[in-house]
């Protein structure tokens, strides 16, 4: 039968957990991405920020998974108004922040 979207969200969370746990060298060679207001922007803004990262196989699946939660095509810089005061952070930190945000969504049952 139908599967609640929370199952897909759990899959995304598990992927982010894998990335943070398996990280040895600097993630994506220490690439920097825009820090964003996840509460205000959600999945599309997260994808927008990560779209700037290329050639990093470690987050390829995350980028693709995020697109499944965003209703439209995202191009880099599309949500620049939701960047946090033009602040950039490392991809590793971005992934950790995103993971915390998604865990909170999951706990609150916002996808059931």
């Amino acid at each position: 039968g139908p599967v609640p979207p929370s199952t897909a969200l759990r899959e995304l969370i598990e992927e982010l957990v894998n990335i943070t746990q398996n990280q040895k060298a600097p993630l994506c060679n220490g690439s920097m991405v825009w820090s964003i207001n996840l509460t205000a922007g959600g999945f599309c803004v997260a994808l927008d920020s990560l779209t700037n990262v290329s050639g990093c196989s470690a987050i390829e699946k995350t980028q693709r998974m995020l697109s499944g939660f965003c209703p439209h095509k995202v191009s880099a810089g599309q949500f620049s108004s939701l960047h946090v005061r033009d602040t950039k952070i490392e991809v590793a930190q971005f992934v950790k922040d995103l993971l915390l945000h998604l865990k909170k969504l999951f706990r609150e049952g916002q996808f059931n």
Epitope: G1, P2, V3, P4, P5, T7, A8, L9, R10, E11, L12, T51, Q63, R64, M65, S67, G68, F69, C70, P71, K73
Partner: antibody, heavy 123, light 107 residues
Framework: EVQLLESGGGLVQPGGSLRLSCAAS????????MSWVRQAPGKGLEWVSA????????YYADSVKGRFTISRDNSKNTLYLQMNSLRAEDTAVYYC????????????????WGQGTTVTVSS | SYELTQPPSVSVSPGQTASITCSGD??????ACWFQQKPGQSPVLVIY???KRPSGIPERFSGSNSGDTATLTISGTQAMDEADYYC?????????FGTGTKVTVLG
Amino acid sequence: EVQLLESGGGLVQPGGSLRLSCAASGFTFSSYAMSWVRQAPGKGLEWVSAFSGSGGSTYYADSVKGRFTISRDNSKNTLYLQMNSLRAEDTAVYYCVQDGLGPYFYNYGMDVWGQGTTVTVSS
Amino acid sequence: SYELTQPPSVSVSPGQTASITCSGDKLGDKYACWFQQKPGQSPVLVIYHDSKRPSGIPERFSGSNSGDTATLTISGTQAMDEADYYCQAWDSSTYVFGTGTKVTVLG
């Protein structure tokens, strides 16, 4: 390793029925949307149907609407395609394909395909 | 219904660049994917999200998408790149595949 194994193809007469199965392994089957794509001999790829993972929505190509039914059994990690009122133009290799996650699964990109099962509709 | 049009064939010499176009109404507003299919084999995704390469796909494959046209470019084409190539997009609750392009590597 993600694997998809189709079965159920064969020779059937016009107007007949056939049910294809796709056994999935190596991933959380229930989370992902799944599709059927076919390819007639010497022709291009044609999408047939999709079943979303998150919402249980189904989608069909106009060419099979009302004749084909896609379904899934998440407890068995299996995708199905029930094909009724088969026509000669349904003759093709049918591929089972892993789609993406979430309500907009179609943004993901179909990167896991089965080896295909052949359906021949002929009298 | 939505249609994606590709040239039937493209010929290229080894080491040269092959470009395959895929045309559809406002295709640039959608994500485009590209698949490679060799005879007797299942299709392989070579480009997703217009220009992203899945892991394991050589750097010589690249993509772009704007306006009404998506383009797959194979730089430094090798004999092993000889295959059929299909673009794909999603429109109005259906997947649409392009008509397909046979890439022939000369020589």
